[in-house]
């Protein structure tokens, strides 16, 4: 057994003092003799215990016995106990009694010889066993009075050795965490959630975390279980930036070609077909209409220009049907409609004129005439002295169903060189100049192009009733679009209902919003809900083909013939079919190129494509001159060309 | 461009005959009329007529029939205004202006001064 | 003949203050109304012609409106380089007449 230093002491203490307890009980002895028996003096006291500091702790006491019990030939047996007690200093017990082992005499002093747990010189004093080495206790040491006790913090429990703490394993018990995943932990446990939920240990449960209350978003915010969404001003110009919580800018990733020709008078700005140009011409001499420019289009279909008076006197309307030049010509109130010539909307520069002979008039292309048509009378008409001439381009200044044979007048073409009347008049040229929308893109492929600040929209019909299923309503959406987008994001096309809800929408998109992943993607929705998605590389300056198919039971999404991958369970297209289905059967917009002002959270993407596009949707081409409405700055049938990097 | 220049200034007496030129440039001269127009100093502007550069027939104001003439030298794209027998009364400024129904381009005056 | 009254004959404004002149023709003339100005010992220089259309290079403090018989030309923010006569000139019937004029002065 090993003994800790201050107990090895106390033990051999009383061993050292054998002897010297031999030597006190003769010297009680001589005492009786000398000093009870007889009065003694300090030198007889001195003999007998043969030592000053004994005598001098004994004298002075045994004189208060006397005084207090009488000499001793008075024989008071008081007075002997009180001389006979005086040598032991252990009598009356000086040491403490509940700390002390044994009370030890010495020469006129005593030693207390303490139980463990005690010390002091009385043994009175508690010793604290935690001081060194924590009491030997792993976790925690509670000294008490005269003793220490081992104890463990919450979690552990104490080993039977009485020192070591062990773990507690609180995830045996299921009530735990009630809802939540139990985590063993030393000394501890957590109660722990997915991610976007947080533990409440009142309701023993998961609940969700709202994101949108810590301010997350710096625009639109939606809640959602275990997570959140940031949504963007799309139609702003702003989509969400790679932390998925701000935003930025939807900038080209594609440059085109977007330089103006100042020289050039664009048809196609006036959706309204209302003209771009009207000229008042005013003469006191005759004259004859002469009119030469320049022209270029991709259009099959429109207006050039009209000459002439009042709707019901004398006027003509050079236009294009078809691709070919077509003269509309009333003179006197009788119409005639002459079509001839080459197909023109082939998008390269060619000469027009039409002149107007004694009886004759003449149109060429390229200087060779492709019609000769003989007129009676004259274009000016004379009133009050002066001969008029009303001209307009790019348009008519009466309504279509006045024509001799209605016609589309939108025309998306381009004129230059312009020569009207032998004019030297500049002021076309001053207006043009001032106005970039009035010029032309220098250059211009087929396609319709999109700016990125508008939209087209079509009254279009996605359902029908077949006659041989009876009443059955059937349904269908197929959209082919042929892409070369100049940004990463932005609506190809939507359907919207009259409550601005999106029952379909294709769009490009520059995240995954669930991965929350940057990634060029396609993605085909139902209002809000992703349907499919389906890479692509948007800015690579390649013509890309979207192909969307939606009827009963099926929904696909595919980019350059590759198929998209589903993001919905089987059970959750059923229901957004049925939505979208719903949808159909009432009043629904279609919308090309943006949507109009619904909410941020309507649909995946609300931004304005740029790019170009053109657009199939089951098996019809849009044209855009078709529309119920286009913005303005959408060229219907003309896209300017990548901007290729020179070396 | 377009420019109309005129003949210079004249003094002349009364009962005398002046004619003035206007020489147009920048423009097919026979497919505009050509006007011309009066302006007594300190006084307004009166159109006086026009002349037809392709035929060459003249028309006048009522008040300016019978001492006035309108002519032409086509070759020379020139339009020429002649006053006869001269009064006090037409001392004024003489413009000639292109036809367009209304007058863009002008020339920059002749002073014409009838004083005994 | 149409004839065209204008008014005031003259007047004298302040720079930056606007400027109205009115002609009234005796017969209706739609639109057919033009607006010159003319400064000393130069020819009259149009600024707007028929169909209250503001002539190319023109500045944009000149304007004009009317139809039928009533025409209002306006300089909005007179400048000092618009002190000259101003005429009105109808083109809607031969004989073509001018108003007598206007003489814009400073004060």
């Known amino acids: 057994v090993l003994l800790r230093a201050r107990e090895a002491a106390q033990f051999l203490r009383p061993r050292q003092r054998r002897a010297y307890q031999v030597f006190e009980e003769a010297k009680q002895g001589h005492l009786e003799r000398e000093c009870v028996e007889e009065v003694c003096s300090k030198e007889e006291a001195r003999e007998v215990f043969e030592n000053d500091p004994e005598t001098e702790y004994f004298y002075p006491r045994y004189q208060e016995c006397m005084r207090k019990y009488g000499r001793p030939e008075e024989k008071n047996p008081d007075f002997a106990k009180c001389v006979q007690n005086l040598p032991d200093q252990c009598t009356p017990n000086p040491c403490d009694k509940k700390g002390t082992h044994i009370c030890q005499d010495l020469m006129g002093n005593f030693f207390c010889v303490c139980t463990d747990g005690w010390g002091g010189r009385l043994c009175d004093k508690d010793v604290n066993e935690c001081v060194q080495k924590n009491g030997g206790c792993s976790q925690v040491c509670h000294n008490k009075p005269g003793s220490f006790q081992c104890a463990c913090h919450s979690g552990f429990s104490l080993a039977s050795d009485g020192q070591t703490c062990q773990d507690i394993d609180e995830c045996t018990d299921s009530d735990t965490c009630g809802d939540a995943r139990c985590k063993n932990l030393p000394g501890s446990y957590s109660c722990l959630c997915d991610e976007g939920y947080t533990y409440s240990s009142k309701e023993k449960t998961c609940q969700d975390v709202d994101e949108c209350q810590q301010d997350r978003c710096e625009q639109t915010c939606v809640n959602s279980p275990g997570s959140y969404t940031c949504h963007c001003d799309g139609r702003g110009g702003l989509k969400l930036s790679p932390d998925m919580d701000t935003c930025e800018d939807i900038l080209p990733c594609v440059p085109f070609s977007m330089a103006k020709s100042v020289k050039s008078l664009y048809l196609g700005r006036m959706f309204s077909g209302t003209p771009v140009i009207r000229l008042r011409f005013k003469r006191l001499q005759p004259t004859r209409l002469l009119a030469e420019f320049d022209f270029r289009t991709f259009d099959p279909e429109g207006v050039l220009f009209f000459a002439g008076g009042r709707s019901d006197s004398t006027w003509i309307v050079l236009g294009l049907r078809a691709g070919r030049l077509e003269l509309q010509l009333r003179y006197n109130g009788v119409g005639r409609i002459t079509s001839s010539g080459p197909t023109i909307n082939h998008g390269m520069w060619q000469t027009i004129s039409v002149e107007e002979l004694e009886r004759n008039l003449v149109i060429k292309v390229n200087k060779d005439a492709v019609m000769k048509i003989a007129v009676a009378g004259e274009l000016f008409q004379l009133e009050r002295g002066l001969y008029h001439l009303n001209l307009t381009v790019g348009g008519i200044p009466f309504k279509e169903s006045e024509l001799v044979q209605p016609i589309n007048p939108r025309l998306d073409g381009c004129m230059r060189s312009w020569n009207w009347l032998n004019g030297e008049d500049s002021a076309i040229q001053e207006t043009v100049k001032a106005n970039t929308k009035m010029q032309c893109f220098s250059v211009t492929e087929r396609g319709s192009f999109f700016p990125g600040n508008g939209f087209a929209t079509y009254r279009l019909n996605y359902t029908r009733t077949s006659l041989d299923v009876g009443t059955e309503t059937t349904w269908e959406v197929k959209v082919v679009a042929r892409i070369r987008p100049a940004t990463d994001t932005g609506v190809l096309l939507a359907l919207v209902g009259d409550d601005d809800v999106v029952p379909i929408s294709v769009a490009l998109v520059d995240y995954h919003s669930t991965k929350k992943l940057k990634k060029q993607l396609v993605v085909l929705a139902v209002e809000d809900v992703a349907l499919a998605l389906m890479e692509i590389k948007v800015c690579d300056s390649q013509e890309h083909t979207v192909t969307v198919s939606l009827r009963e039971g099926e929904a696909t999404l595919e980019v350059d013939g590759t198929k998209g991958q589903s993001e919905v369970s089987t059970a959750q297209l059923q229901e957004r079919l049925d939505t979208l289905k719903t949808h159909l059967q009432g009043s629904v917009h279609t919308y090309v190129g943006g949507l109009p002002e619904v909410s941020v959270i309507s649909a995946p993407v609300t931004a304005f494509y740029r790019g170009c596009m053109t657009l199939e949707v089951n098996g019809k081409i849009l044209d855009l001159d078709t529309a119920s409405y286009k913005h303005s700055d959408i060229t219907s049938h003309s896209c300017p060309p990548v901007e290729h990097a020179t070396p | 461009q377009i420019q109309l220049v005129q003949s210079g200034p004249e003094l002349k007496k009364p009962g005398e005959t002046v004619k003035i030129s206007c020489r147009a440039s920048g423009y097919t001269f026979t497919n505009y009329g050509m006007n011309w127009v009066k302006q007594a100093p300190g006084k307004g502007l009166k159109w006086m007529g026009w002349i037809n550069t392709n035929t060459g027939e003249p028309t006048y104001t009522e008040e300016f029939k019978g001492r006035f003439a309108f002519s032409l030298e086509t070759s020379a794209t020139t339009a020429y205004l002649q006053i006869n027998d001269l009064k006090n009364e037409d001392t004024a400024t003489y413009f000639c202006a292109r036809d367009e129904g209304w007058f863009v381009y002008w020339g920059q005056g002749t002073l014409i001064t009838v004083s005994a | 003949e149409t004839t065209v009254t204008q008014s005031p004959a003259s007047l004298s404004v302040a720079t930056g203050e606007k400027v109205t002149i009115r002609c009234i023709t005796s017969t209706d003339i739609d639109d057919d109304m033009n607006w010159y100005q003319q400064k000393p010992g130069e020819p009259p220089k149009l600024l707007i012609s028929?169909?209250?259309t503001l002539r190319p290079g023109v500045p944009s403090r000149f304007s004009s409106s009317g139809y039928g018989t009533d025409f209002v030309f306006t300089i909005e923010n007179t400048l000092s380089e618009d002190v000259a006569d101003y005429y009105c000139l109808q083109t809607d019937s031969v004989p073509l007449t001018f108003g007598a004029g206007t003489k814009l002065e400073l004060k």
């Open positions: 028929e169909g209250n």
